[in-house]
Amino acid sequence: MMCLECASAAAGGAEEEEADAERRRRRRGAQRGAGGSGCCGARGAGGAGVSAAGDEVQTLSGSVRRAPTGPPGTPGTPGCAATAKGPGAQQPKPASLGRGRGAAAAILSLGNVLNYLDRYTVAGVLLDIQQHFGVKDRGAGLLQSVFICSFMVAAPIFGYLGDRFNRKVILSCGIFFWSAVTFSSSFIPQQYFWLLVLSRGLVGIGEASYSTIAPTIIGDLFTKNTRTLMLSVFYFAIPLGSGLGYITGSSVKQAAGDWHWALRVSPVLGMITGTLILILVPATKRGHADQLGDQLKARTSWLRDMKALIRNRSYVFSSLATSAVSFATGALGMWIPLYLHRAQVVQKTAETCNSPPCGAKDSLIFGAITCFTGFLGVVTGAGATRWCRLKTQRADPLVCAVGMLGSAIFICLIFVAAKSSIVGAYICIFVGETLLFSNWAITADILMYVVIPTRRATAVALQSFTSHLLGDAGSPYLIGFISDLIRQSTKDSPLWEFLSLGYALMLCPFVVVLGGMFFLATALFFVSDRARAEQQVNQLAMPPASVKV
């Protein structure tokens, strides 16, 4: 077995990878020249295709290996891994996709921007929605809960579908679906609050299809450092879309003089993007970048896939670590603006807020910081990983672990600084969030390394489900509950309002440290799990009879 990790480190950058691909393409071209109409051409025409003994299979990490050869003309014979569909048909090799792959990744990333833009446009006009529908805080909580719950429930379903059916069609349908629902929701009459709740649930389902399947297409279009880069771009869409959502919500509302129009922007863009996905995203086969072409379709049951994922220790630990990130971001996003407002009340630089929105200025600053640190975190994480891959085989999980543990320190310092300096608190938030967000793209990349292509959508879905369930679905409520519990046992004062929330939020750095530990655990099993995935991919490239996953 070739040292897969070293292969990763050896190819220092995307440029080398493209050069590798070019060399492979030339070699394949020479073989095709000798063999007439391509490696599968003879069999496609009805004859027996003879496979060259030197055919290559590109692995999950992008390394090239000699493939075992089967009997001539056997489906699944390397060199004929992309089973011909008709006389002389050939499957395009990933290298031949060229600029199209970049365009596809760009469109998928744009779709992700829109996913989050849509989600946070609603957040940007939430006060107006509450005012218009007469929604109480528990009603606003219901809107959030319904969205997250429907997203969580739908994610595994789309994971299953994404591993078995045409992914770009599912993606486009998902975008068209949530676009139509969001657009329709802008016309819901005041008395039908329940329709608004239902619409958020349906949008959650539509967006789950995208979040689950899109990363797996990128995973199948690219390998190694290029994949890390493309996933970084894809995941940068989260802070970018979120920030743009807030901006879109408030600016469109002001321009049109009616908040309803804010909900009509992302659906129009969504319809355009959905169409572009259908046109520009290639119908990439699972494991395409791994040179496994059409051979890879999930032949295992969903239950078997789940069992395999649960036994995959790198996957389990990285998913638990992702849940820790989700827990912290959910809780901090909900409570930090109010906490900082209370800090200012204690410092006598602001008055006690009697009518909401409380800490509106802090929300705006926090939103801007989150947007920028999201970008900075993704870039820093990807860069650090790329550099560390030259030094160690376990670079990915180790960079994540260091980021998490570093983040925990700065999140702790927020509560120290807030007592005396709001600026100091914001600096700690900035550094803490940058470190926290540095693992977004890397976590996705870890998943791509340790999970075989036919299970990736399911894996992304299960990870998404877990991170919401153990993370942001409950953390805002838990922090609020702990804060109230502390306040009940203390005297009613602005100081204790501030301190109780601060003590409750101290749970976040502990959870983040726990997440760091999970990433360290991932590092322990990463090399072996990655090697196992490589082995399974090679088995998948063999005749179906010999596949045992």
Epitope: Q131, H132, F133, G134, V135, K136, D137, R138, G139, L142, F187, P189, Q190, Q191, F193, N354, S355, P356
Partner: antibody, heavy 125, light 107 residues
Framework: EVQLVETGGGLVQPGSSLKLSCATS????????MSWVRQAPGKGLEWVAL??????????NYAESVKGRFTISRDDSKRRVYLQMFTLRDQDTATYYC????????????????WGHGVMVTVSS | DIVLTQSPATLSVTPGESVSLSCRAS??????IHWYQQKSNGSPRLLIK???QSISGIPSRFSGSGSGTDFTLRINRVESEDFSVYYC?????????FGSGTRLEIK
């Protein structure tokens, strides 16, 4: 049976203050949004102020004509809603009605489903 | 602020006739309109909510319609106790506003 009973009205001079009170019964007061609506003699209805429930952080909203001069408040334990009026003007002379908004637990309506009998406030020198 | 214009200001009818009262909004307000009846020296009471939804305890001869900017309250076969002032109210946006009212009187 739902009952809303206003008290505290009377004759006052311009620039002075007055506090109206509304006692309630027959519904879950703590979850219900409450408003004051007034009607000048021989004129139409005018909404004055609204106070939301605890789950809406007791947010208060006011008509532009009374903003900064009137304060609406509530006491859930006493099931009462109040309208504190400062710097009263001649044009504040009206019958003041205490009203409730229909509640749906997760959200509330903005229409007025129950009305008190009203209390007369006369501002005159 | 959303301005509601009611017409006519006064409507004279004989008992047994059917009448339509109009309320026009200064901008589109979907179906966020409500109708109240105020008898002389009495408090207003809710007749119709959200343009067309009936209220329990209110006679079925009262019905509402409309959406956007134009709304109508219809009284089928007016009875003697229906002679009062009718107000429309919008809840589309704050501040909550009322129409100037339509007085229904005996011809």
């Amino acid at each position: 049976e739902v009952q809303l009973v206003e008290t505290g009205g009377g004759l006052v001079q311009p620039g002075s203050s007055l506090k109206l009170s509304c006692a309630t019964s027959g519904f879950t007061f703590s979850d219900t949004w409450m408003s004051w609506v007034r009607q000048a003699p021989g004129k139409g209805l005018e909404w004055v102020a609204l106070i939301k429930d605890k789950n809406s952080n007791y947010e208060a909203n006011y008509a532009e004509s009374v903003k900064g001069r009137f304060t609406i408040s509530r006491d859930d334990s006493k099931r009462r809603v109040y309208l504190q009026m400062f710097t009263l003007r001649d044009q504040d002379t009206a019958t003041y009605y205490c009203t409730s908004h229909e509640d749906f637990y997760y959200y509330s309506s903005y229409y007025f489903d129950y009305w008190g009998h009203g209390v007369m406030v006369t501002v005159s020198s | 602020d959303i301005v509601l214009t009611q017409s006519p200001a006064t409507l004279s009818v004989t008992p047994g006739e059917s009448v339509s009262l109009s309320c026009r909004a200064s901008q589109g307000i979907s179906t966020s309109i409500h109708w109240y009846q105020q008898k002389s020296n009495g408090s207003p009471r809710l007749l119709i909510k959200y343009a067309s939804q009936s209220i329990s305890g209110i006679p079925s001869r009262f019905s509402g319609s409309g959406s956007g900017t134009d709304f109508t309250l219809r009284i089928n076969r007016v009875e003697s106790e229906d002679f009062s002032v009718y107000y429309c109210q919008q809840t589309y946006s704050l501040p909550l506003t009322f129409g100037s009212g339509t007085r229904l009187e005996i011809k």
